[in-house]
Amino acid sequence: MMTGTIETTGNISAEKGGSIILQCHLSSTTAQVTQVNWEQQDQLLAICNADLGWHISPSFKDRVAPGPGLGLTLQSLTVNDTGEYFCIYHTYPDGTYTGRIFLEVLESSVAEHGARFQIP
């Protein structure tokens, strides 16, 4: 039975040209995390594998940095980066857990971080 929950940075906003850290955290399970995939809508951004380490998709290499931890740092943000991001935790023996983050990239300088929330 899957007992874990994913805590994410929730709905967040950031300024155009700036950077943002996307973070997810898996809790309430002793399952082993074997891999975390980061996706933006229908695009694979990056993968962190327990054995192989990080792979950043070549088309995002200039603007995506691994970490901190299992998180992902997006740099040189543009308005086109606005949208949903998913962290997909592959675990053993539980299976797959998915967390969602919504990022809004703002033109103005009034970008504030949203509250954290949990996805069961």
Epitope: Q32, Q43, L44, N49
Partner: antibody, heavy 118, light 107 residues
Framework: EVQLLESGGGLVQPGGSLRLSCAAS????????MSWVRQAPGKGLEWVAS????????SYADSVKGRFTISRDNSKNTLYLQMNSLRAEDTAVYYC???????????WGQGTLVTVSS | DIQMTQSPSSLSASVGDRVTITCRAS??????LNWYQQKPGKAPKLLIY???SLQSGVPSRFSGSGSGTDFTLTISSLQPEDFATYYC?????????FGGGTKVEIK
């Protein structure tokens, strides 16, 4: 240089068994998921089975479930496919492939031919 | 199971032609789509992974695009060594499935 070398193919009667081996070299075998893919004569590619790296998580195609067993020996850098209750429709070239991040198959062996016929 | 449908199943083209092969998934597979080239009697060779990433050592005339259910492999200027069969493959979920293949022949 990454190399995958399959062996163990041959002619076997229906209902018989074979064990295929895939000897890996040139990379840290234990860090990679691995798969078997087959190709019947004149046909397309068909995935057979996969095994993960660290946890040994296994999955099979429905067509071979209960008859084939994928396994690995990380100390020998070798992937195996035990094939039992073989049928004529299992006749194919069997390839082993390395699967980084369980997403793409970046290196393939040269294949070994399995022929099931009476 | 996710079905992968490739089109066309075969095509004739000349050296220098721009060639486009499409692959459609029966459900969304995000960008978990790979393209392989296979020549007679040889093992498949990875060309494109994760829909659009060019595998190391593969010529830049090969490119991939698409996400969700619709994907494309493009060869910008067909070379003599490109005459082969091309397969798409989804790795979104097991069972892993391949398209039926597209044979690129000399016109």
């Amino acid at each position: 240089e990454v190399q995958l070398l399959e062996s163990g193919g041959g002619l076997v009667q229906p209902g018989g068994s074979l064990r295929l081996s895939c000897a890996a070299s040139g990379f840290t075998f234990s860090s990679y998921a691995m798969s078997w893919v087959r190709q019947a004569p004149g046909k397309g590619l068909e995935w057979v089975a996969s095994i993960s790296s660290s946890t040994g998580t296994i999955s099979y195609a429905d067509s071979v479930k209960g008859r084939f067993t994928i396994s690995r020996d990380n100390s020998k850098n070798t992937l195996y496919l035990q094939m039992n209750s073989l049928r004529a429709e299992d006749t194919a070239v069997y390839y082993c492939a390395r699967v980084p991040y369980s997403v793409w198959m970046d290196y393939w062996g040269q294949g070994t031919l399995v022929t099931v016929s009476s | 199971d996710i079905q992968m449908t490739q089109s066309p199943s075969s095509l004739s083209a000349s050296v220098g032609d721009r060639v486009t092969i499409t692959c459609r998934a029966s459900q969304s597979i995000s960008s978990y789509l790979n393209w392989y080239q296979q020549k007679p009697g040889k093992a498949p060779k990875l060309l494109i992974y994760a829909a659009s990433s060019l595998q190391s050592g593969v010529p830049s005339r090969f490119s991939g695009s698409g996400s969700g259910t619709d994907f494309t492999l493009t060869i910008s200027s067909l070379q003599p060594e490109d005459f082969a069969t091309y397969y798409c493959q989804q790795s979104y979920s097991t069972p892993l499935t391949f398209g039926g293949g597209t044979k690129v022949e000399i016109k």
